[in-house]
């Protein structure tokens, strides 16, 4: 009979690509089916896998928080890369949030390092700074 076009809201979701596992593993950008017979592609922009694996589901893409900029988007083989906005940094011991960089050094100290997305400004005592200057002259 005549083929009926589906209304936009009824359109079937595209089938995820399938292939066979190799040595029981699926390549980056895929996860394995429950029965272990198929490799199913991750959904671009939604989830990913970085290595050969037998994950039952791909890993959810990270969403950059407000206060972060997206350096690179999530692909099927790589998670989103987020970086703190200018003037803020992320510390190793509190990686969940970006903190404001200090605007200046305390009295008696001088700045020897700028604010970066991964470190606050660096301050040292004036005497230490003078010694460093002599050392690197």
């Amino acid at each position: 009979g005549p083929s009926m076009a589906l209304a936009p809201q009824q359109r079937a979701a595209p089938q995820q690509k399938r292939s066979s596992p190799s040595e029981g593993l699926c390549p980056p950008g895929h996860h394995i089916s429950e029965d272990g017979r198929d490799c199913i592609s991750c959904k671009y922009g939604q989830d990913y896998s970085t290595h050969w694996n037998d994950l039952l589901f791909c890993l959810r893409c990270t969403r950059c928080d407000s206060g972060e900029v997206e350096l690179s988007p999530c692909t099927t083989t790589r998670n989103t890369v987020c970086q703190c906005e200018e003037g803020t940094f992320r510390e190793e011991d509190s990686p969940e949030m970006c903190r404001k960089c200090r605007t200046g050094c305390p009295r008696g100290m001088v700045k020897v390092g700028d604010c970066t997305p991964w470190s606050d400004i660096e301050c040292v005592h004036k005497e230490s700074a003078a010694a460093l200057e002599v050392l690197f002259q």
């Epitope: 190799s22 593993l25 390549p27 290595h51 050969w52 037998d54 589901f57």
Partner: nanobody, 126 residues
């Protein structure tokens, strides 16, 4: 969220035995293969053993082959590591891991994992 909980660690004399358990909660193990890694004091994490939960295929590091046996009970969502003929060099924190990651399909040794337990300490000493 996949959560792995190890138990069974402790102090044992050289030549002794221990059985470690790894129970999964949440979306089960999140992968077909489940493994054990260990980390000795001051050293990096090293692969110990893995098992396929569907067909029971097992994998072992050369250092534990013939002494350690990995097994699973799918009805209990648990993987076991039976450790016999223990040596002082087996002293380490043992971690259960799932979502094992490999650089190539043919590799027998995973380079890491997605999901980790909190670890259980095994001390082999007289």
């Amino acid at each position: 969220e996949v959560q792995l909980l190890e138990s069974g660690g402790g102090l044992v004399q050289p030549g002794g035995s221990l059985r470690l358990s790894c129970a999964a909660s949440g979306r089960t193990f999140g992968s077909i293969r489940v493994g054990w890694f260990r980390q000795a004091p001051g050293k990096g994490r090293e692969f110990v053993s893995a098992i396929n939960r569907n067909d029971g295929t097992t994998y072992y590091a050369d250092s534990v082959k013939g002494r350690f046996t990995i097994s699973r009970d799918n009805s209990k969502n648990t993987v076991y590591l039976q450790m016999n003929s223990l040596r002082p060099e087996d002293t380490a924190v043992y971690y259960c891991a799932a979502g094992l990651q490999y650089n190539r399909a043919a590799d027998r040794v995973p380079v890491g994992a997605v999901y980790w337990g909190q670890g259980t300490l095994v001390t082999v000493s007289s």
